[in-house]
């Protein structure tokens, strides 16, 4: 009954692990979508908004076929860490205007943090090589105006939405290969 002492514990089914990661990612995608709607409603901003410090989108969903799980998880984790930093910056740097997006923005930050921990766990369960700790990123520049901060918020939430959408599709596709 049970494995002999000293033998490795059977690791959980990686497909189940991936499933729970997809669920968390989907949930965060929905949070981001709702917050983006709220932002557009309260602070309309025409056109696309960019922020140089944001990661570029990993790639189109169509190009996912060629990807391998390790590279997807590694890239996703790096991008989401950047978005976490940007959300933290947004919450602290912005004055009264964006304070009206609380507590939703705080909840988004907490869930993004949770997803990152889940990705870290998944990578260790799949025995993927652990990345060295990221070098400290340069501090994000203060917004030059409230309007600049609002545009940054649009860019951050819009970019996070695209990244999470890409992540859900990619993880689901890669699950079929496990």
């Amino acid at each position: 009954p049970g494995p002999p002492p000293g033998s490795p514990r059977a690791s959980p089914d990686p497909r189940a692990e991936l499933d729970s990661t997809v669920l968390l990612t989907r949930s965060l995608l929905e949070d981001t979508r709702q917050l983006t709607i709220q932002l557009k409603d309260k602070f309309p901003a025409d056109g696309d908004h960019n922020l140089d410090s944001l990661p570029t989108l990993a790639m189109s969903a169509g190009a996912l076929g060629a990807l391998q799980l390790p590279s997807v998880l590694t890239r996703l984790r790096a991008d989401l860490l950047s978005y976490l930093r940007h959300v933290q910056w947004l919450r602290r740097a912005m004055g009264s205007s964006l304070k009206t997006l609380e507590p939703e923005l705080g909840t988004l930050q907490t869930r993004l943090d949770r997803l990152l921990r889940r990705l870290q766990l998944l990578m260790s369960r799949l025995a993927l090589p652990q990345l060295p700790p990221d070098p400290p990123a340069p501090p994000l520049a203060p917004p030059s105006s409230t309007w600049g901060g609002i545009r940054a918020a649009h860019a951050i939430l819009g970019g996070l939405h695209l990244t999470l959408d890409w992540a859900v599709r990619g993880l689901l596709l890669l699950k079929t290969r496990l």
Epitope: S97, P139, S144, W147, G149
Partner: antibody, heavy 117, light 111 residues
Framework: QVQLVESGGGVVQPGRSLRLSCAAS????????MHWVRQAPGKGLEWVAV????????FYADSVKGRFTISRDNSKNTLYLQMNSLRAEDTAVYYC??????????WGQGTLVTVSS | QSVLTQPPSASGTPGQRVTISCSGS????????VNWYQQLPGTAPKLLIY???LRPSGVPDRFSGSKSGTSASLAISGLRSEDEADYYC???????????FGGGTKLTVLG
């Protein structure tokens, strides 16, 4: 260069009203949240109210809630503070201040409001 | 009673280094950026430090800010007579939905 000039201060009796104005120039007024901060004679700074760049969001200090109203006219580059039911403890120099986010980068020179019978 | 706590006074001689502390809570300093303002006698306040530790252009590098947890501090090195002023710390407070200030610290340059 950025300039903020307050006006409208003066001596007023308790219970009466007063409207302060802050004329802004040298920057795109409609891109910035704006605040009012006051300082009673010989005392420290006290935050009063803030209005968002578009005028849609407003927050007030508990001490003035229900009595003071902050507003702005972006077409006139002007910030206002309507002060009703004034009390002796509202006596102070009132400053308007610009914020690009979490700090006040420019302040006006202030206008003195004295509430006295 | 101010939400942020500062010592009412501080002093030093020219050339010395002085530090002014500012203590708050998790809803203000702990979760938002700290700013410092200098108010020379008879004038409007002026931004000295923002974003915890950044200096606006024109502010000498003798002035520096730092933050740890729910406390912040302003350090002034190479003290000069023109530094004699009131210094205020400030931050947004999430619980109060507004800006809070410290009570102010009157800095005296001796001699």
């Amino acid at each position: 260069q950025v300039q903020l000039v307050e006006s409208g201060g003066g001596v007023v009796q308790p219970g009466r009203s007063l409207r302060l104005s802050c004329a802004a120039s040298g920057f795109t007024f409609s891109h910035y949240d704006m605040h009012w901060v006051r300082q009673a004679p010989g005392k420290g700074l006290e935050w009063v109210a803030v209005i968002s760049y578009s005028g849609s969001v407003k927050f007030y200090a508990d001490s003035v809630k229900g009595r003071f109203t902050i507003s702005r006219d972006n077409s006139k580059n002007t910030l206002y503070l309507q002060m009703n039911s004034l009390r002796a403890e509202d006596t102070a120099v009132y400053y308007c201040a610009r914020t690009p986010g979490s700090h006040f980068d420019y302040w006006g020179q202030g206008t003195l409001v004295t509430v006295s019978s | 009673q101010s939400v942020l706590t500062q010592p009412p006074s501080a002093s030093g001689t020219p050339g010395q280094r002085v530090t002014i502390s500012c203590s708050g809570s998790s809803s203000n300093i702990g979760s938002n950026y700290v700013n410092w303002y200098q108010q020379l006698p008879g004038t409007a306040p002026k931004l000295l430090i923002y974003y915890d530790d950044l200096r606006p252009s024109g502010v000498p590098d003798r002035f520096s800010g730092s933050k740890s947890g729910t406390s912040a501090s302003l350090a002034i090195s190479g003290l000069r007579s023109e530094d004699e002023a009131d210094y205020y710390c400030s931050a947004w407070d999430d619980s109060l939905s507004g800006v809070v200030f410290g009570g102010g610290t009157k800095l005296t340059v001796l001699g």
